[in-house]
Interface confidence: low
């Protein structure tokens, strides 16, 4: 029996809902009383989700599950997941048994944008060219770890001094802190770049110097 | 920066046990699986089991159940393998690695490497 | 256990040549391969992880693909800092699994 599901990861934003596709041919004169639906997590074999004896079994899951009931007779075994978490992310295998059996397992990529950064500068007055200050990139509550790069206002890399740190909170959503140390010239203009790799979705912040004073854009 | 710093070299006699660290930084070690590889000299690399440092919740390959014991102190942020009853086929690179994404079996961030040598 | 071979275990090859290096599992692993960089110090480093993806860091010269049970790494203009020993690992099921690693030398 061939059991399809995609062979891309799927992408599902936190607190989404996200749907695992999967599916098989019936044959001719295929009845639901026939069939034996499990969704496992794929490594440690849990139970997800199952459907027996011509009957939804229910999730398993934290009840965040369903199956398509009107849709299993045509061979859509697909599972939907709610209200998506960073700690769902991973393999989950579909098994499909009629008479024949199979399975196939599809990979659920879990990501969250990240907000837009928040710039500090120390120390942040009576600033001279020469000085050397720490600025601080900072964004928030987003997955998976972020990819960071600081320019000038010329577009040029700053790729010394450069430390990033990425805790992870309760949720597995992670905050990202980005320092890089300068010294400054007559003005310019530091510009920090988060990158969400999977979304490849980019937040920009930066800080303009420029003698005195300093502004700060407003947030966008 | 994340980084995974392993103890040093240890060298031990038949039947003894030894007891070898990884200490991470950079990263919630409480939310990442921590595993141990082993490398025999000149061989391929052996997965012999990972520890989730929140709960302490272990899995071993069946060949290293009752050879390797895996814990976690979550205040130092530090892994350890014990080795017991050690015999020259111990003799190995045994490695610490970071899982990477929640069940997707990839280990993207790797310590140097401890030098285990079991010799009479 | 799923077996992983790479029957491949030296490979010689001249700077900027386009290196392929195979892997193959003994079942279908779904995508779920990785292939990682050991150094000749053994410093061991994620390259690419479920078959194509490129992890942080590894410069673009280096790809993978395959399906089923037949999957390859490909280094592009090959430079002096890849001359390493390359393994590839199933990460489908439970235990993970290495190929025996293929040793990468310069020509």
């Known amino acids: 029996l061939e059991v399809q599901v995609p062979e891309d990861p799927v992408v599902a934003l936190v607190g989404t809902d996200a749907t695992l596709c999967c599916s098989f041919s019936p044959e001719p004169g295929f009845s639901l009383a026939q069939l034996n639906l499990i969704w496992q997590l794929t490594d440690t074999k849990q139970l997800v989700h199952s459907f027996a004896e011509g009957q939804d079994q229910g999730s398993a899951y934290a009840n965040r599950t369903a199956l398509f009931p009107d849709l299993l007779a045509q061979g859509n075994a697909s599972l939907r997941l709610q209200r998506v978490r960073v700690a769902d992310e991973g393999s989950f295998t579909c098994f499909v048994s009629i008479r024949d059996f199979g399975s196939a397992a599809v990979s659920l990529q879990v990501a969250a944008p990240y907000s837009k950064p928040s710039m500090t500068l120390e120390p942040n007055k009576d600033l001279r060219p020469g000085d050397t200050v720490t600025i601080t990139c900072s964004s928030y509550r987003g997955y998976p770890e972020a990819e960071v790069f600081w320019q000038d206002g010329q577009g040029v890399p700053l790729t010394g001094n450069v430390t990033t740190s990425q805790m992870a909170n309760e949720q597995g959503l992670f905050d990202v802190h980005s320092v890089l140390r300068v010294v400054l010239g007559a003005n310019g203009t530091y510009s920090c770049l988060v990158r969400n790799p999977v979304l490849q979705q980019d937040a920009h912040g930066s800080v303009t110097i420029t003698g005195q004073p300093m502004t700060f854009p407003p947030e966008a | 920066q994340v980084q995974l710093q392993q103890s040093g070299a240890e060298l031990a006699r038949p039947g003894a046990s030894v007891k070898l660290s990884c200490k991470a930084s950079?990263?919630?070690?409480?939310?990442?699986?921590m595993q141990w590889v082993k490398q025999r000299p000149g061989q391929g690399l052996e997965w012999i089991g990972t520890?989730?440092?929140?709960?302490?919740?272990?899995r071993y390959t069946q060949k290293f159940k009752g050879k390797a014991t895996l814990t976690a102190d979550k205040s130092s942020s530090t892994a350890y393998m014990q080795l017991s009853s050690l015999a020259s086929e111990d003799s190995a690179v045994y490695y610490c690695?970071?899982?990477?994404?929640?069940?997707?079996?990839?280990?993207?961030?790797w310590g140097a490497g401890t030098t285990v040598t079991v010799s009479s | 256990d799923i077996q992983m071979t790479q029957t491949t275990s030296s490979l010689s090859a001249s700077l900027g040549d386009r290196v392929t290096i195979s892997c193959r599992a003994s079942?279908?692993?779904?995508?779920?391969l990785n292939w990682y960089q050991q150094k000749p110090d053994g410093t061991v480093k994620l390259l690419i992880y479920?078959?194509?993806r490129l992890h942080s860091g590894v410069p673009s010269r280096f790809s993978g693909s395959g399906s089923g049970t037949d999957y390859s790494l490909t280094i592009d203009n090959l430079e002096q800092e890849d001359i390493a020993t390359y393994f590839c690992?199933?990460?489908?099921?439970?235990?993970?699994?290495f190929g025996g690693g293929t040793k990468l030398e310069i020509k």
């Open positions: 079942q279908d692993i779904s995508n779920y």
């Open positions: 690992q199933q990460g489908n099921t439970l235990p993970p699994t």
């Open positions: 950079g990263y919630t070690f409480t939310s990442y699986w």
């Open positions: 520890i989730y440092p929140g709960d302490g919740d272990t």
């Open positions: 479920y078959t194509s």
């Open positions: 690695a970071r899982r990477g994404i929640p069940r997707l079996w990839y280990f993207d961030v």
